[in-house]
């Protein structure tokens, strides 16, 4: 029998120091470029090897970025979000949402982390 797939959503504050080549990641999303259905949020699509984000290690591909230096990324055009990152300065604080896929036990059995029984 197939297990049920659930998601564990956590938030984290990540402080990055801009490196010689910048912050070192790529994004998708925005009100004019929805990457996820019915969600105009900004998502990390790629972490660049040896960039600031990769060396820090906490930001992951697929993470949703909620804010940059305290500025909310809701309802932003894609290019406005890009510009916000590019103008964020040397020390950059990111509020991010991680979405971790959790594979529960087979249906009909109580799997670990499945409080519904």
């Amino acid at each position: 029998m197939n297990g049920r797939v659930d998601y564990l959503v956590t938030e984290e504050e990540i402080n990055l120091t801009r490196g010689p080549s910048g912050l070192g990641f790529n994004i998708v999303g925005g009100t004019d470029q929805q990457y996820v259905s019915n969600d105009s949020g900004i998502y990390v699509s790629r972490i660049k090897e040896n960039g600031a984000a990769a060396l820090d290690g906490r930001l992951q591909e697929g993470d949703k970025i909620l804010s940059v230096n305290g500025q909310d990324l809701k309802n932003l055009l894609h290019q406005d979000a890009v510009d916000l990152f590019r103008n964020a300065g040397y020390a950059v604080s990111l509020r991010v949402q991680h979405r971790l896929q959790v594979q529960n036990g087979p249906i009909g059995h109580r799997g670990e982390g499945d409080p519904s029984g």
Partner: nanobody
């Protein structure tokens, strides 16, 4: 997964024109940053042209500037390369490339490593 299929290549005389197409499938095409690259026999793959996701920004290699025009039709999931005043040195396999991102840093759109997906290529021969 993103699939890219080039078409429109062929044999043309010097001074002639060709229009290459790159049809994309997979994710939402309108989020892709796109580029055309080319590879001549015995040479490395080189950048020809780049277009951003909206079509509002384009860049060209010096060798094709003024002769080639890159464009895209997001409704048709297709990118184009109009090649005019072709020269024998334009002979190469032409590849389209796609990336589903915008860099939060300035990036080098002429670097093949900045692109995530590649087509199989279409041969252009200028005699």
């Amino acid at each position: 997964q993103v699939q890219l299929v080039e078409s429109g290549g062929g044999l043309v005389q010097a001074g002639g024109s060709l229009r290459l197409s790159c049809a994309a499938s997979g994710r939402t095409f309108s989020t892709y940053t796109m580029g055309w690259f080319r590879q001549a026999p015995g040479k490395e793959r080189e950048f020809a042209a780049h277009i951003n996701w909206s079509g509002g920004s384009t860049n060209y290699a010096d060798s094709v500037k003024g002769r080639f025009t890159i464009s895209r039709d997001n409704a048709k999931n297709t990118m184009y390369l109009q090649m005019n005043s072709l020269k024998p040195e334009d002979t190469a396999v032409y590849y389209c490339a796609a990336a589903i991102w915008s860099s939060v840093d300035s990036y080098d759109h002429s670097d093949p490593l900045e692109y995530d997906y590649w087509g199989q290529g279409t041969q252009v021969t200028v005699s």
